[in-house]
C-alpha cells in the first residue's frame, strides 16, 4: 500500500539498515526510496529536546511485514518509501537549505557570486554531490562568498550541523541540468585500470552501466563477461572512479567491456529499469518466496508486485508437471544485485520492474515503427498531439508533443491572435482528425507559456509550453517523449522523423491521417547557405533533403522532430519555419530543443 504522508512525532522501532544524514524528512524519504532495501524511515528534526548530534539523522529501515511498531517521540518524523507507490519518482532536489552546513569531503573551494552559481558549479562538476556556500553576511571575512564542493561515499552528507549565514544544497545532475558530456558508448575488449569503489554481480555490461549510473561514487566501470578467463570474476561489475573523472589507463583485454556512468543523460535513458530476461542464467540471492508461475513474464510480474523482491529466477516446468507451471524464485540481496550468477542450469532470470518508475516515463519502449509509407499507425507517435482552437469554429491549429503529464511543448508562433487558453483543446492519442467529434475527450489548457524572447519564428525562440488543466494518464497511445540531454549536444542523430497532419499556416490543406516522413538533419552551415536572408542560429536545427523529394509539409507547426538514439526517442526539434512544400525544397527549420532544456525545466518544475 502506498503511504505518502509523513508521520510527525513518530518513530519506527527496529528494522534499522543504516543511518545517513539528510537536511529534511522529505529528502530522507527520497533516499529511502532509492536504497535497494529501505521500506520505512525515521528522520530526526532539529529540536531543543533532541541531542544535536542526532539532528538530521535519517534511519533507513526494512521489515518483512512492510511495517514496524510506532513509538511517540518529539522531533521524530517517520514515513514509508515510495517503492510501494505507482507514481513517478525523481531524485531531483532543488531545495536550498539555509543555515545548514552539510559535511563531506571538501575537495574544491572557489569564490562564487551566489548560491545559485555555486549549485551550478556543483552540477557541472563530475565529483560533486552537494555544496555549502558562505553568504556575504558570513562572519569570517576570508570565507565570504566561498563555494565548497563536496562528495561522500554515499552521496549524502556525513553530518549536518547548524551554521549561521551559510546555505547548502545538492547537485542538480538528477534534474537533467548538468552540462557534463553524456558518453553512452560501451567499449569492447577494454579494462579501465582505476580504483574500484565497489563491485557487484551483473548479467551484462548494460546492467553494469546502469548500476554505475545510480551509484553515487561511480564515474565509469569495467565488466567481465561470462567468457572471462578467470572464473571467479565472471559477471563481475567493477564500479570505478579517478581524480580526473576519466579513466587514467585503458588496457586491451578480451571478454571485458567498459563504459561510463550515464549520470548526465539519466533523465532520457533508462538507468534503473533492467527489463531484459537472461536465459540459461540463475541469479543467486536471499530467497524471499517460491511461487508457481506460468512463464518467466509472469514470474517478473510477481517479483514486481512483491515490494521486497529485487530479482528472480524462473525454472520452467518439466513436461506435464504442476499444470505446466514452473517455479518462480523471488529474491533479494543487500545491494539489489545477485550475489552470484550461474549459467547452464536452464533458469531464466531478470529484475523487478518496480524500479522503472524511477526512470523517466519517456524512456519506455514503444511499439516497433512501421517501415515505409507516409501514413502513421495508431500508437506509432504516442507523444504527438493535435492542438485545436474553438474560435471562430473548431479546427486543428498546430501540432505539439507530450513532455510531461501536464505539459505540451509546441511552437510560440502557433498562438498569434490567440487571446486566451480557454479557446484551446489538446487531443492526444489521435490518429485521424475525423475521430474528433463533439464528445471526444480533450485536455483543456490552463496556461500558455511563450518564451519571453520570442518575436517571430524566423528570429528564433519559437517555443511554448501548454500547461494542461488535468493530467495525462500514460497509455500505449499517449505518453511522453524524452527531451534531449544537454550532455548529448554533440550526438549525430541519424534516425529522425517529422510528423503531423500536414498543416502549415499558408497552405490550409490538412491531412486526415497523421503523416510521417524520415528526414536527415542538415548542418547549420549548410542550412545558412540555403536561407541567405535569415540568420540560422545555434538555437535552430535544420532537417530536410538536399535534393528535395520529401514532403516537409508532413510536419505541422509546433509538432515534433523526433529522433531515435540508443533505442529511446528524443524531441530534437519543434517544427518552426521554412520553405518545405514549395517546389524548392529548402530544409525545414526547427527550434533546437536541447538549447531550451533549462528553460523548459525552469517553467515545468516551478512550484
Amino acid at each position: 500500500e502506498c503511504v505518502t504522508q509523513l508521520l510527525k512525532d513518530t518513530c519506527f522501532e527496529g528494522g534499522d539498515i543504516t543511518t545517513v544524514f539528510t537536511p529534511s524528512a522529505k529528502y530522507c524519504q527520497v533516499v529511502c526510496t532509492y536504497h535497494p532495501r529501505c521500506l520505512l524511515f525515521t528522520f530526526t528534526a532539529e529540536s531543543p529536546s533532541e541531542d544535536p548530534t542526532r539532528w538530521f539523522t535519517c534511519v533507513l529501515k526494512d521489515s518483512v511485514t512492510e511495517t514496524l511498531p510506532r513509538v511517540n517521540r518529539t522531533a521524530a518524523i517517520s514515513g514509508y518509501s515510495f517503492k510501494q507507490c505507482s507514481h513517478q519518482i525523481s531524485a531531483c532536489n532543488k531545495d536550498i537549505y539555509v543555515d545548514l552546513d552539510m559535511k563531506g569531503i571538501n575537495y574544491n573551494s572557489s569564490v562564487a557570486k551566489s548560491a545559485q552559481e555555486c549549485q551550478e558549479r556543483c552540477t557541472d562538476d563530475v565529483h560533486c554531490h552537494f555544496f555549502t556556500y558562505a553568504t556575504r553576511q558570513f562572519p569570517s571575512l576570508e570565507h565570504r562568498n566561498i563555494c565548497l564542493l563536496k562528495h561522500t561515499q554515499t552521496g549524502t552528507p556525513t553530518r549536518i550541523t547548524k551554521l549561521d549565514k551559510v546555505v547548502s544544497g545538492f547537485s542538480l545532475k538528477s534534474c537533467a541540468l548538468s552540462n557534463l558530456a553524456c558518453i553512452r558508448d560501451i567499449f569492447p575488449n577494454t579494462v579501465f585500470a582505476d580504483s574500484n569503489i565497489d563491485s557487484v554481480m551483473a548479467p551484462d555490461a548494460f546492467v553494469c552501466g546502469r548500476i554505475c549510473t545510480h551509484h553515487p561514487g561511480c564515474l565509469f566501470f569495467t565488466f567481465f563477461s561470462q567468457e572471462w578467463p578467470k572464473e571467479s570474476q565472471r559477471n563481475l561489475c567493477l564500479l570505478k572512479t579517478s581524480e580526473s573523472g576519466l579513466p587514467s589507463t585503458r588496457i586491451k583485454k578480451s571478454k571485458a567491456l567498459s563504459g561510463f556512468s550515464l549520470q548526465s543523460c539519466r533523465h532520457s535513458i533508462p538507468v534503473f529499469c533492467h527489463s531484459s530476461f537472461y536465459h540459461d542464467t540463475d541469479f543467486l540471492g536471499e530467497e524471499l518466496d517460491i511461487v508457481a508461475a506460468k512463464s518467466h513474464e509472469a514470474c517478473q510480474k510477481l517479483c514486481t508486485n512483491a515490494v521486497r523482491c529485487q530479482f528472480f529466477t524462473y525454472t520452467p516446468a518439466q513436461a506435464s508437471c504442476n499444470e505446466g507451471k514452473g517455479k518462480c524464485y523471488l529474491k533479494l540481496s543487500s545491494n539489489g544485485s545477485p550475489t552470484k550468477i550461474l549459467h547452464g542450469r536452464g533458469g531464466i532470470s531478470g529484475y523487478t520492474l518496480r524500479l522503472c518508475k524511477m526512470d523517466n516515463e519517456c524512456t519506455t519502449k514503444i511499439k516497433p515503427r512501421i517501415v515505409g509509407g507516409t501514413a502513421s499507425v495508431r500508437g506509432e507517435w504516442p507523444w504527438q498531439v493535435t492542438l485545436h482552437t474553438t474560435s471562430p469554429t473548431q479546427r486543428h491549429l498546430c501540432g505539439g508533443s507530450i513532455i510531461g503529464n501536464q505539459w505540451i511543448l509546441t511552437a510560440a508562433h502557433c498562438f498569434y491572435g490567440v487571446e486566451s487558453p480557454k479557446i484551446l483543446r489538446v487531443y492526444s492519442g489521435i490518429l485521424n482528425q475525423s475521430e474528433i467529434k463533439e464528445d471526444t475527450s480533450f485536455f483543456g489548457v490552463q496556461e500558455i507559456i511563450i518564451h519571453d524572447q520570442y518575436k517571430m519564428a524566423e528570429s528564433g525562440y519559437d517555443i511554448a509550453l501548454l500547461k494542461l488543466e488535468t493530467t495525462v494518464n500514460y497509455t500505449d497511445s499517449q505518453r511522453p517523449i524524452c527531451l534531449p540531454s544537454k550532455g548529448d549536444r554533440n550526438v549525430i542523430y541519424t534516425d529522425c522523423w517529422v510528423t503531423g497532419w500536414g498543416y502549415r499556416k499558408l497552405r490550409d490543406k490538412i491531412q486526415n491521417t497523421l503523416q510521417k516522413a524520415k528526414i536527415p538533419l542538415v548542418t547549420n552551415e549548410e542550412c545558412q547557405k540555403r536561407y541567405r536572408g535569415h540568420k540560422i542560429t545555434h538555437k535552430m536545427i535544420c532537417a530536410g533533403y538536399r535534393e528535395g523529394g520529401k514532403d516537409a509539409c508532413k510536419g505541422d507547426s509546433g509538432g515534433p522532430l523526433s529522433c531515435k538514439h540508443n533505442e529511446v526517442w528524443h524531441l530534437v526539434g519543434i517544427t518552426s519555419w521554412g520553405e518545405g512544400c514549395a517546389q524548392r525544397e529548402r530544409p525545414g527549420v526547427y527550434t533546437n530543443v536541447v538549447e531550451y532544456v533549462d528553460w523548459i525545466l525552469e517553467k515545468t518544475q516551478a512550484v
Partner: antibody, heavy 120, light 107 residues
C-alpha cells in the same frame, strides 16, 4: 503593382562613400528579401548581399563584406546600400531586386539601377 | 562558392531560329536555377525559375530544362525583340551566383 524605385546617379571621389536607396511599393515590404546586385560597365552581374526587411538581418558577399552596409526603414518601405572606401573599379550600376519567395529564390522585380561613377 | 559556367559567351542567329544556351554548375544545385534577360541600359528581367517554370507574362517560346549540374535555356523561335544578354543564376546556396552571360545577336 510591384515597383522598386532607386535613387539617381552619383559621382564620387575615391575613398568616399555612396548610399543608394530603393523604395518598394505594391507589396508587403517586410515579407520579401531585398538583394543588391552590381554590374560593372560591359561586365556580368555580381551579387553583393541581401537584407531581410522584416528582421533587419543582412548577409554580404565576402568580396564586399568589409565595405558594404545594408539597412532598411520599414515605415517608408525603403532599403539602402552603402558602399564605403570607394575605388575606381567600383564604378558600376547597382540594382536592388526583390526575391520571388519569402525565403529567397529568383529575383522577380528589379529597380531601374543606379549608376555610381568613381573618379578623381 | 558555386561557379556557373555559361556557354557560348555570344551567339548570332536568325529570326525564327531555335537558340540554345547551356549553363554548367560546379556542384549540384537541385532545381534552383533561374534565367534572366537583360537589354542594354535596363535591369535584368526574370524569365525562368526553378529550372523550367516560366515567370508570369513570359512568352511560351522561352523554356528551360536540365537537372543537377547541367541546364539549358531555349528560345524555340527567335524574335527580333529577343536581342539581349541572357544570364543563368543558381539560388541553391549562398552566395547566389550568375553565369558570365550570353550575348545574343541577330544575323
Amino acid at each position: 503593382q510591384v515597383q522598386l524605385v532607386q535613387s539617381g546617379a552619383e559621382v564620387k571621389k575615391p575613398g568616399a562613400s555612396v548610399k543608394v536607396s530603393c523604395k518598394a511599393s505594391g507589396y508587403a515590404f517586410s515579407n520579401y528579401l531585398i538583394e543588391w546586385v552590381g554590374q560593372a560597365p560591359g561586365q556580368g552581374l555580381e551579387w553583393m548581399g541581401v537584407i531581410n526587411p522584416g528582421s533587419g538581418y543582412t548577409n554580404y558577399n565576402e568580396n564586399f563584406k568589409d565595405r558594404v552596409t545594408m539597412t532598411r526603414h520599414t515605415s517608408i518601405s525603403t532599403a539602402y546600400m552603402e558602399l564605403s572606401r570607394l575605388r575606381s573599379d567600383d564604378t558600376a550600376v547597382y540594382f536592388c531586386a526583390r526575391t520571388y519567395g519569402k525565403y529567397g529564390g529568383a529575383m522577380d522585380f528589379w529597380g531601374q539601377g543606379t549608376l555610381v561613377t568613381v573618379s578623381s | 562558392d558555386i561557379q556557373m559556367t555559361q556557354s557560348p559567351s555570344s551567339l548570332s542567329a536568325s529570326v525564327g531560329d531555335r537558340v540554345t544556351i547551356t549553363c554548367k554548375a560546379s556542384q549540384s544545385v537541385s532545381n534552383d536555377v533561374a534565367w534572366y534577360q537583360q537589354k542594354p541600359g535596363k535591369a535584368p528581367k526574370l524569365l525562368i525559375y526553378y529550372i523550367s517554370n516560366r515567370y508570369t507574362g513570359v512568352p511560351s517560346r522561352f523554356s528551360g530544362s536540365g537537372s543537377g549540374t547541367d541546364f539549358t535555356f531555349t528560345i524555340s523561335s527567335l524574335q527580333p525583340e529577343d536581342i539581349a544578354t541572357y544570364y543563368c543564376q543558381q539560388d541553391y546556396s549562398s552566395p547566389p551566383t550568375f553565369g558570365q552571360g550570353t550575348k545574343l545577336e541577330i544575323k
